[in-house]
């Protein structure tokens, strides 16, 4: 950090300001040195003596050039659902962030105050919007022709396999089951397939575009910390 060379306090010229890394002391009516990050003012300046700075004690810090009488206390230790991404030092506060599989439900200036587990979409529902550091997963019901058979915070709805002959039709939570003749896997939810008789296809004949059409938007789940809603599980 930039070094501050000690000097006798001085009265600024009329219309002039103190230099950078200095402050105007109203009592002394002098420009005085600030203390560097990691320090605080032990003794304030006078007309004849400059600020006396001292190092911050353990578990306290100052991040900025300052003339505060006491250093700030570092935040409390990170909770079990958090990881410490920045340790408490004399120059910086501890920063806690959410561990994988969790998101920040209540943030603070730096890091996170409260973490919550990412919502898991139950079978029949897939991830519409993945979780981020600061937002929960949004689940949606699997559209016709797609399914999800997992309880997951990452799995999306996948297309049913296309059967030459269907043994068991697929639904929102289960893939189609084909008879012993080898199936051809649909490549994408909206893939267009060659026409064939209805009886030889999976349960749905019309490819469905993703994301699903307007009526299913009512199933989008709210953001933020909330009790498990339809399509999600707290497990």
């Amino acid at each position: 950090l930039p070094a501050q060379v000690a000097f006798t306090p001085y009265a600024p010229e009329p219309g002039s300001t103190c230099r950078l890394r200095e402050y105007y002391d109203q009592t002394a009516q002098m420009c005085c040195s600030k203390c560097s990050p990691g320090q605080h003012a032990k003794v304030f300046c006078t007309k004849t003596s400059d600020t006396v700075c001292d190092s911050c004690e353990d578990s306290t810090y100052t991040q900025l050039w300052n003339w505060v009488p006491e250093c700030l206390s570092c935040g409390s230790r990170c909770s079990s659902d958090q990881v410490e991404t920045q340790a408490c030092t004399r120059e910086q506060n501890r920063i806690c962030t959410c561990r994988p599989g969790w998101y920040c439900a209540l943030s603070k200036q730096e890091g996170c105050r409260l973490c919550a587990p990412l919502r898991k979409c139950r079978p029949g529902f897939g991830v519409a919007r993945p979780g981020t550091e600061t937002s929960d997963v949004v689940c949606k019901p699997c559209a016709p022709g797609t399914f999800s058979n997992t309880t997951s915070s990452t799995d999306i709805c996948r297309p049913h396999q296309i059967c030459n002959v269907v043994a068991i039709p697929g639904n929102a939570s289960m893939d189609a089951v084909c008879t012993s003749t080898s199936p051809t896997r649909s490549m994408a939810p909206g893939a267009v397939h060659l026409p064939q008789p209805v009886s030889t296809r999976s349960q749905h004949t019309q490819p469905t575009p993703e994301p699903s059409t307007a009526p299913s938007t009512s199933f989008l789940l709210p953001m933020g910390p909330s009790p498990p809603a339809e399509g999600s599980t707290g497990d």
């Epitope: 950090l1 890394r21 991040q63």
Partner: antibody
Framework: QVQLQQSGAELARPGTSVKLSCKAS????????MQWVKQTPGQGLEWIGA????????RYIQKFKGKATLTADKSSSTAYMQLSSLASEDSAVYYC???????????WGQGTSVTVSS | QIVLTQSPAIMSASLGERVTITCTAS???????LHWYQQKPGSSPKLWIY???NLASGVPARFSGSGSGTSYSLTISSMEAEDAATYYC?????????FGAGTKLELK
């Protein structure tokens, strides 16, 4: 390594405003003052002011009060200078420079050329 | 404010020649806060000498600086082609910081 990346050249009409940026990397942005300097062929190098991104404290010389406004965005480590009510005499190259030991400007941006013309 | 006067404004020097550029302050300046910058056409200034006599990183040892009070100087012991540039002195002993008008050093 420390780098200061300034925004591209500006061509502006008299009376309008421009906002120049200076993106810092390679050091703790909030711990160092960022200074701004104007350079013209006639006037040479002229200090405009400085900002401390840590707390937003800013200083200006009298001549540039009301002309220049310094801001800083901690999240993107970027310092900004807005120049308002532009006139032909504001045409210059503007530099951002980091305040280092003993108030020496130890790292400089590449400069942004501002041309004010009708 | 403190006015810095550089001399000469322009000068030419031959390869190997000793070069001295001076910077005179209108009032006394602490040597700690007197600096020099080098600038080449189309480039930004570079810190060259800080606190009167300390060479910035990468500056060749043929450069030196000295002075106190109101009189400061930058010296090149043996001019080289790459030294052709404009040199500025700068003070931040008191606000506002000020610069000299520059000395343009050309290769003869």
């Amino acid at each position: 390594q420390v780098q200061l990346q300034q925004s591209g050249a500006e061509l502006a009409r008299p009376g309008t405003s421009v906002k120049l940026s200076c993106k810092a990397s390679g050091y703790t942005f909030t711990s160092y003052w960022m200074q701004w300097v104007k350079q013209t062929p006639g006037q040479g190098l002229e200090w405009i002011g400085a900002i401390y991104p840590g707390d937003g404290d800013s200083r200006y010389i009298q001549k540039f009060k009301g002309k220049a406004t310094l801001t800083a965005d901690k999240s993107s480590s970027t310092a900004y200078m807005q120049l308002s009510s532009l006139a032909s005499e504001d045409s210059a190259v503007y530099y951002c420079a980091r305040d280092g030991n003993y108030y020496a400007m130890d790292y400089w941006g590449q400069g942004t050329s501002v041309t004010v013309s009708s | 404010q403190i006015v810095l006067t550089q001399s000469p404004a322009i000068m030419s020097a031959s390869l190997g020649e000793r070069v001295t550029i001076t910077c005179t302050a209108s009032s006394s300046v602490s040597s700690t806060y007197l600096h020099w910058y080098q600038q080449k056409p189309g480039s930004s200034p570079k810190l060259w000498i800080y606190s009167t006599s300390n060479l910035a990183s990468g500056v060749p040892a043929r450069f030196s600086g000295s002075g106190s009070g109101t009189s400061y100087s930058l010296t090149i012991s043996s001019m080289e082609a790459e030294d052709a540039a404009t040199y500025y002195c700068h003070q931040y002993h008191r606000s506002p910081p000020t610069f000299g008008a520059g000395t343009k050093l050309e290769l003869k």
